[in-house]
């Protein structure tokens, strides 16, 4: 005859307030005849948690059907967990006896402790934008978790980052803890569409980590490159000059044309296009009237991007006498 063993596989069970806790207990033998009861604590003052046969235990249900003939699973579920439920739970086998049943064997116990889930991580980027090749800092914060052990990882576009510092507070015992981590990220010119992710893993999350994200588009400024060109074709008395502003971010941009130092107020045609990497291109066309009196026209395209100092490009217009006379199309 096999000796009865009471198996409680979990030494520690972490549960969150309001949830249901499952306490496992299996037996290795049906003998001796008698009930299995659940208690919290030990000694004469121990608290009866569940007795299948009598008593009132509205928060407790059994995992399997205890009335099945050869049932060996005496696991229970306790609903609506509160802080008052913490403690060590024992499943205890009794042998039928007279006048009282006699305690025969106890399981090793499962300690139920309160776990609290971390809050959703909040990721904050720098207050001001920075240009590529520079380093920016992102912070990630999550609060209210217990126990203290927690894992935090940083990713940029799915690639794990290594340059970060993490602190968990407080250092001593507490009912709940907070984590704060700062990651240093080197910006690349193509980072407009990039994301940084802060990932928090905790025992209460059951393998499903929480993530907070920040878009690098909020942190990066890609300054434009300028090119001013004169179109080879001429329409009547007018020459078309193009200012191409390439690869900038964010979209905020002011463009002004100057003729020989004088700012031109007249309307100009322009188009804005978005590149695959999230940066923008802006093309502005400026029509210059050509007359005999205008031999030396210097055009300036000035761009003020995202509140930064203006940058400009100049073009000395090339108009040949032949072009003036013939009104024919010309290549400068």
């Amino acid at each position: 005859e096999e000796e009865l063993q009471m198996i409680q596989p979990e030494k520690l069970l972490l549960v969150t307030v309001g949830k249901t806790a499952t306490l496992h207990c299996t037996v290795t033998s049906l003998l001796p005849v008698g009930p299995v009861l659940w208690f919290r604590g030990v000694g004469p003052g121990r608290e009866l948690i569940y007795n299948q046969k009598e008593g009132h235990f509205p928060r407790v249900t059994t995992v399997s059907d205890l009335t099945k003939r050869n049932n060996m699973d005496f696991s229970i579920r306790i609903s609506s967990i509160t802080p008052a439920d913490v403690g060590t739970y024992y499943c205890v086998k009794f042998r039928k006896g007279s006048p009282e049943n006699v305690e025969f064997k106890s399981g090793p116990g499962t300690e139920m402790a309160l776990g609290a889930k971390p809050s959703a991580p909040v990721v904050l980027g720098p207050a001001a934008r920075t240009t590529p090749e520079h380093t920016v800092s992102f912070t990630c914060e999550s609060h209210g978790f217990s126990p203290r052990d927690i894992t935090l990882k940083w990713f940029k576009n799915g690639n794990e980052l290594s340059d970060f510092q993490t602190n968990v507070d407080p250092t001593g015992q507490s009912v709940a803890y907070s984590i704060r981590s700062t990651a240093r990220v080197v910006l690349d010119p193509w980072d407009v569409r990039s994301q940084v992710i802060c990932e928090v893993a905790h025992v209460t999350l059951q393998g499903d980590p929480l993530r907070g994200t920040a878009n690098l588009s909020e942190a990066i400024r890609v300054p434009p490159t300028l090119e001013v060109t004169q179109q080879p074709m001429r329409v009547g008395n007018q020459v078309n000059v193009t200012c191409q502003v390439r690869k900038f971010y964010p979209q905020s941009l002011q463009l002004t044309w100057s003729e020989n130092g004088n700012v031109c107020q007249r309307e100009t045609a322009s188009t804005l296009t978005e590149n695959k990497d999230g940066t923008y291109n802006w093309t502005s066309w400026f029509l210059v009237n050509i007359s005999d009196q205008r031999d030396d026209v210097v055009l300036t395209c000035q761009v003020k991007h995202d509140g930064q100092l203006a940058v400009s490009k100049r073009l000395a217009l090339e108009v040949t006498v032949h072009q003036k006379d013939q009104s024919s199309d010309a290549t400068p």
Epitope: P44, R46, K53, H56, T67
Partner: antibody
Framework: EVQLVQSGAEVKKPGATVKISCKVS????????MHWVQQAPGKGLEWIGR????????KYAPKFQGRVTITADTSTNTAYMELSSLRSEDTAVYYC??????WGQGTLVTVSS | EIVLTQSPATLSLSPGERATLSCSAS???????LYWYQQKPGQAPKLWIY???NLASGIPARFSGSGSGTDFTLTISSLEPEDFAVYYC?????????FGQGTKLEIK
């Protein structure tokens, strides 16, 4: 829904035997202890005993030991309480209850010559 | 056998007043095994408080239970007319199970 329905009132002569039934529904009688409690007119509650219908194991209060027999029929989901050698002081309402939580409506037994 | 002694036998109070019912055990009773029942005339007892301090389903929050060892208490913070009844404490810590003799809560 858990229900415990007891048999009707009984009038018995001293020395006779009474057998009260308690038919349950909403649960399997084998799963719980079935208790019996006495309440004499104007008096308090007194525990008589209980049965584990799964294996017919019984426990009785010393006061009733020898005169009371509690049985259960698992096929009909019914518990029984039989009290013999009735005397006038056995005049009372008898309750069955399931595991101390749910009670039957009571059965009045009057012992009178 | 564990003898349960309830006091007072009768408690006369008015609605709105606070009621304190005591139950004293002749030997120690684990709090898990101390129940209270309410009974009204012509009705079966109803489970009112289980495991010393837990209110059975549907029992108003003005009721509370406390105690340990040999001394247990049922308290009603502010009496309502429907609270007037007989209350019994009950132990099922050891055989034979026993009840207190009851406290009758009556309207003053």
């Amino acid at each position: 829904e858990v229900q415990l329905v007891q048999s009707g009132a009984e009038v018995k002569k001293p020395g006779a035997t009474v057998k009260i039934s308690c038919k349950v529904s909403g649960f399997n009688i084998k799963d719980y202890y079935m208790h019996w409690v006495q309440q004499a007119p104007g008096k308090g509650l007194e525990w008589i005993g209980r049965i584990d219908p799964e294996d017919a194991e019984t426990k009785y209060a010393p006061k009733f030991q020898g005169r009371v027999t509690i049985t259960a029929d698992t096929s009909t989901n019914t518990a029984y309480m039989e009290l013999s050698s009735l005397r006038s002081e056995d005049t009372a309402v008898y309750y069955c209850d399931r595991g101390l939580a749910y009670w039957g409506q009571g059965t009045l037994v009057t012992v009178s010559s | 056998e564990i003898v349960l002694t309830q006091s007072p036998a009768t408690l006369s109070l008015s609605p709105g007043e606070r009621a304190t019912l005591s139950c004293s055990a002749s030997s120690s009773v684990s709090s898990s095994y101390l129940y209270w029942y309410q009974q009204k005339p012509g009705q079966a007892p109803k489970l009112w408080i289980y495991s010393t301090s837990n209110l059975a389903s549907g029992i108003p929050a003005r009721f509370s239970g406390s105690g340990s060892g040999t001394d247990f208490t049922l308290t009603i913070s502010s009496l309502e007319p429907e609270d007037f009844a007989v209350y019994y404490c009950h132990q099922w810590s050891s055989y034979p199970y026993t009840f207190g003799q009851g406290t009758k809560l009556e309207i003053k």
